[in-house]
Amino acid sequence: HSDGIFTDSYSRYRKQMAVKKYLAAVLGKRYKQRVKNK
C-alpha cells in the first residue's frame, strides 16, 4: 500500500498539524524573545 489510498490518513494528518502547531509556538516564542532583546 505504499502507493495506495491509505497513505493519507486522518491520524497522520493530525500528527502533522500538531507538529506544525508546536513549531509555530516555538518559533513565535523565539521571535518574541529576539524582539524583546533588541
Partner: antibody
Amino acid sequence: QSVEESGGRLVTPGTPLTLTCTVSGFSLSSAVMNWVRQAPGKGLEWIGSIVASGTTYYASWANGRFTISKTSSTTMDLKMTSPTTEDTATYFCARGGGEFFIWGPGTLVTVSS
Amino acid sequence: DPVMTQTPSSTSAAVGGTVTISCQSSESVYSNYLSWYQQKPGQPPNFLIYQASNLASGVPSRFKGSGSGTQFTLTITDLECDDAATYYCAGGYSENIVGFGGGTEVVVK
C-alpha cells in the same frame, strides 16, 4: 486547509465536462484526493481517488466514464467523458485516504437535453 | 465492488434519547478504515469518526463508533435537536476502493 470545486454547469448528454478542485493550505504532492458525488435526494457515491504519485483508483461503475488527473500542486480535475442524465449530481472533492476529512462545498452538474 | 449496507434508512428519537445506526460490509474493511459522516441539507458531509471508533477533532463524545471487520455501529446518546441529519458510513478496502452506506436519516422529536 480547504478545498473548493468549480466548473459545474448545465450540459447536454454526451458533452464532455471537466470539474476542477483547488486546494489551499496543503499540496497535492503529499495528499490523497477524492471525487464523491450525490444525486439530488440520494446518498453519497465515491467516484475515485488520486494519490500523491498520481496513481488513480476508481469505483468499478466509474471506470472509463470519469478521468481524474492532477494539473498542478494545488489543482486536480475530474473529466466526465460522456455524461448522461444519470450523472446529474453535486460533485464534491475531499481529502483523505479511505476516510474523507476535508470536504469542499460541492459543485452542481445538471445533464439535460 | 464491496457493498456497504446501512440500517435503518430512517430513525427517530426524542431529545435526550439514543440512536443506533448499523453498517454491514460485504467484505472486511482494510485495517479498520471505517468512517462516519453527518450531513445536513445543502451542506457537504461533516467528518465524525475515523478508523471505526476514533472521534474527529471537535466532535462531541456523545457520538460513539464501534465494531470491526464487517460489522460497525454508530451510537448517538443524549440526542440534541442539532443532531437531526443524515448519517453515512464509508469503508476503505484493500483493493484501494471506498464504499459508502446508503445513509440513515435521524429525526429528533
